[in-house]
């Protein structure tokens, strides 16, 4: 029988009756177009909907849309569209909701074609007022609020100009002109590639790269001859063109851009590209693509100096640049993340890394099922997840892969189990473990979504006929109990609930299609009455991430520490609730040479856990850039992996000497930097 | 070979403490949660609560809860149990077991080894 | 807590008899159950983990089934040494055990 299907799967006792008295239905008085949604603040129940329908007249398209708001999580909606004054309102820039609990939200008016600039609609009560504010500029860009403070915001003009406000989007001023990309980094600080000749296409590569740490009033020139710039974690980089040809190499500053490294990376030619995959404060992921039309590239892992990098991961998967690569974090666990390889046969292997890029290895075959045709040996396969790159070649792939923070070890994705990624009609496999062992948990492909921190997953078949039935589960995906929510079976668009998986709530999106008409509905379901007590301490269990061989006494040791978690059981069927936190106890343990990456000039052959040096650096002095200076470094080849929190056992030495000399190539030397004020 | 040696019998009064020791040998001491269940004359197994020594961390029944403080002692591979406020139905012969363990679940798998058992009388 | 409920209570039975135990969860608790066996004066032995599983050593006329809240031990064939005393007991949090089978001789 499928999984979760079996007589003994323990049934939630009268939950027809429980969830019949708790699924609220809204029929949208609207023509069917597009619809989208935002959540407006964490925990406040907010979400707006704003669907647009456009008429396609002789000449030109005329445009409607409404605004739609509810305060109960989706049960109840109210029609606002009149407190925008019934504007047409552009869906390309959505709804820029403030971050954190701010409650702002800009919405970007469509205007028309002979005004001086465009128009906004501001909120700061969680859309219950709105006011209008004409532009001076015609945004290019949605509004982006600086993360620190709510009240600033920038944007981008057509005519790249690069345009701040102070309060909130009541007045706006322009800071700079020959603007091609802005962001904002931290303290309020704002960076910005501008160009001198043409425009951000002729003079790329020749980009400057600035810097406003007071919204315009001064400004720095923090690097010239710059392709393109990023941010991650407390890194920034910059791709510089090389002086004599046409590559370019990575640099990067953990000083807002006072100084600057290159980084030991290879460089990329016109057609290649470099990409940050993930960062945090400790460490980066970078992709650097192969030469050629390959569709693959290395991912290479950073020290905590963004500086030195180690090799993580052949073949990887990303055809162009903002291509599709299929590289996800597993956020339900610490050090785990899962993407694509390309193989030398071009099919397409799943990998999965335990130790934030130490290792790869293939995902386990899942013990309940069998190897399709992909697979050589019938007994020997393994799982392959279905991401990005599935659902771009138009697979038959509603989701990418799901995990949460808070709901611990959970990973939901779907997959084929053989030699390779199939292109058959995939199932949905679960994980409780972080992607350490699988389970198919429903046949076929399915929307899923998961609710309380773990205790209830969701899902709704994909199909393409009309669909009244969501199946739920209470038991981390082992048995599913459907429940249909309508008679009248709806077109399925989507799935919504409050991110960050704490809810109770999931709201079903669709229309429904009549003769003359269609209209956009929504079914709201609240799971409150199926887990009708809260969670208490006899409804978790203990549970050591990351767990191999109880009898290695560094059983769980990830980046030199392990956590156990308190995890729900999977036969309490109780709510953790809105307020719930995950629980996790840390135990240091003792350092090995897994806790460290290899410096500077040294590499790991492969299956060995020892640092050798470089063939090429045999016997020259190890002399390097850093900050602008000639760094001499005597090391015996290891340095700490970052994030890394062993203490005790191997302890390799390492010292660095600054040489005082300055290093002549790098193209961001502090010298070439300049300021300026307005 | 795996097992669990544990401190002799015990005679006590009734309001005493009684703490019970339980020597591992032959596997990773660290890696297994070590439970404690008791069995009264003529009568059933009884879970008290179990310990992960890495951690620290102890897990106890709801009816011993505030009687019963479970420990262990990394470097000498033990593990104590200790009951307090005795009264006479708490004569019982008092078992450790290791929690078998497959994979991060400490509890899911049964208790796979046993100590002898301890006898503990409760008596005036 | 999860209530275990073993049935019967004693059974009596002859060497070479199939003889099959039942044990009920009063809510599902999967597959985290195991069985024991005990003989006067001994501790326990495990048989029989996560429902269905032989613990290694353990003769295979033992076998386990059962998921959810309904579970079963079966002995296949019973032989002198299986007289004893056998308990469930559900793994899946705070443990429990049931109340026991005593298997005695017809």
């Known amino acids: 029988s499928a999984p979760g299907e079996d007589e003994e799967c323990g049934r939630v006792r009268d939950f027809v009756a429980k969830l019949a008295n708790n699924t609220h239905q809204h029929v949208f008085d609207d023509l069917r177009g597009s619809v989208s949604l935002s959540w407006v603040g964490d925990s406040t129940g907010v979400i707006l909907v704003l669907t647009t329908f456009h008429v396609p007249l002789v000449i030109m398209t005329f445009g409607q849309s409404k605004l739609y708001r509810s305060e109960d999580y989706g049960k109840n909606f109210k029609d606002i569209t009149d407190l925008i004054n019934n504007t047409f309102i552009r869906t390309e820039f959505g709804m820029a909701i403030g971050p954190e609990n701010s409650g702002k939200v800009v919405l970007t008016a469509e205007v028309s074609g002979g005004s001086r600039g465009g128009r906004i609609f501001r909120s700061s009560d969680f859309a219950k007022n709105f006011v209008q504010t004409d532009l001076p500029f015609h945004p290019l860009t949605q509004m982006m609020y600086s993360p620190q403070n709510s009240d600033y915001l920038l944007a981008l003009s057509t005519e790249n100009g690069l345009w701040v406000s102070k309060n909130f989007g009541g007045k706006w001023e322009e800071i700079h002109k020959a603007v091609c990309l802005a962001k904002w980094g931290s303290d309020n600080t704002i960076f910005f590639t501008t160009y001198a000749n043409g425009s951000c296409k002729a003079d790329l590569g020749a980009l400057e790269l600035w810097r406003t740490s007071d919204l315009g009033k001064s400004f720095k020139t923090i690097g010239v001859k710059i392709y393109s710039f990023g941010l991650g974690g407390r890194f920034l980089f910059a791709s510089v063109m090389a002086d004599k040809d046409t590559t370019r190499r990575i640099h990067v500053s953990t000083d807002q851009g006072d100084t600057w490294s290159m980084a030991q990376l290879p460089s990329v030619g016109q057609e290649q590209f470099y990409s940050i995959l993930a960062a945090n404060d400790d460490m980066v992921f970078m992709h650097v693509d192969e030469p050629g039309d390959t569709g693959f590239g290395t991912i290479f892992t950073s020290d905590d100096r963004g500086i030195v990098y180690s090799k993580s991961l052949d073949r990887h998967l990303y055809t162009t640049t903002g291509g599709e690569t299929d590289f996800t974090n597993v956020t339900s666990l610490r050090g785990v993340y899962i993407t694509s390889v390309l193989s030398e046969d071009n099919s397409i292997q799943t990998m999965i890394t335990f130790d934030q890029g130490g290792r790869w290895t293939h995902l386990r075959k899942p013990e309940n099922s069998e190897c399709d045709a992909t697979a050589k040996n019938k007994n020997e396969c393994s799982l392959h997840i279905h991401a990005s790159y599935s659902i771009s070649q138009k697979l038959n792939v509603p989701m990418a892969p799901l995990s949460e923070p808070n709901a611990v070890g959970i990973v939901i994705a779907h997959g084929s189990v053989g030699d390779a990624i199939s292109v058959m009609v995939p199932d949905v496999y679960i994980s409780d473990d972080g992607g350490y062992s699988w389970t198919k948990m429903l046949e076929g492909p399915h929307y899923y979504t998961i609710l309380d921190s773990g205790g209830i997953i969701v899902a709704i078949e994909h199909s393409s006929r009309p669909i009244n039935v969501i199946k739920f589960s209470t038991d981390e995906g082992q048995c599913w109990q459907t429940y249909t929510f309508t008679r009248d079976p709806i077109y399925f668009t989507g799935l919504a609930s409050e991110p960050g998986a704490r809810s109770m709530n999931i709201s079903i999106w669709g229309f429904t299609e009549s003769f003359l008409t269609s209209q956009w509905v929504s079914y709201t379901i609240d799971f409150k009455d199926i887990l009708e007590r809260n969670c208490e301490e006899k409804d978790y269990t203990i549970w050591l991430a990351h767990s191999t061989d109880p009898e290695d006494y560094e059983d769980g040791c990830i980046l030199g520490y392990k956590e156990q978690f308190l995890r729900l059981r999977k036969s309490s069927v109780c709510q953790n609730g809105r307020d719930y936190v995950v629980t996790k106890q840390p135990s240091i343990c003792l350092c090995s040479l897994e806790d460290f990456l290899c410096d500077f000039g040294y590499y790991r052959p492969e299956n060995d856990s020892k640092c050798v040096e470089q063939p090429e650096l045999k016997g020259h002095d190890l002399e390097f850039c850093l900050y602008g200076r000639e760094e001499h470094l005597t090391t015996n080849g290891y340095r700490k992996i970052p994030g890394d929190k062993c203490q005790g056992g191997v302890n390799p030495v390492r010292e660095v000497k600054d040489l005082k000399k300055k290093c002549t190539s790098n193209f961001l030397s502090p010298e070439k930097q300049n300021s300026k004020s307005n | 070979q795996v097992q669990l040696v544990q401190s002799g019998a015990e005679v006590k009064k009734p309001g005493a403490s009684v703490k019970v020791s339980c020597k591992a040998s032959g596997y990773t001491f660290t890696g297994y949660a070590m439970a404690w269940v008791r069995q009264a004359p003529g009568q059933g197994l009884e879970w008290m609560g179990g310990i992960i020594p890495t951690f620290g961390t102890a897990w106890y029944a709801q009816k011993f809860q505030g009687r019963v403080t479970i420990t262990a002692d990394e470097s000498t591979s033990t593990a104590y149990m200790e009951l307090s406020s005795l009264r006479s139905e708490d004569t019982a012969v008092y078992y450790c077991?290791?929690?078998?363990?497959?994979?991060?679940?400490?509890?899911?798998?049964?208790?796979?080894?046993w100590g002898q058992g301890t006898t503990v009388t409760v008596s005036s | 807590d999860i209530q275990m409920t073993q049935s019967p209570s004693t059974l009596s039975a002859s060497v070479g008899d199939r003889v099959t135990i039942t044990c009920r969860a009063s809510q599902s608790i999967s597959s985290w159950l195991a069985w024991y066996q005990q003989k006067p004066g001994k501790a326990p032995k495990l048989l029989i983990y996560?429902?269905?599983s032989l613990e290694s050593g353990v003769p295979s006329r033992f076998s386990g089934s059962g998921s959810g809240t309904e579970f079963t031990l079966t002995i296949s064939s019973l032989q002198p040494d299986d007289f004893a005393t056998y308990y469930c007991?559900?793994?899946?949090?705070?443990?429990?055990f049931g109340g026991g089978t005593k298997v005695e001789i017809k």
């Open positions: 996560k429902a269905s």
């Open positions: 007991q559900q793994a899946d949090g705070h443990i429990t």
């Open positions: 077991a290791r929690q078998g363990r497959k994979t991060g679940y400490y509890y899911y798998y049964g208790m796979d080894v």
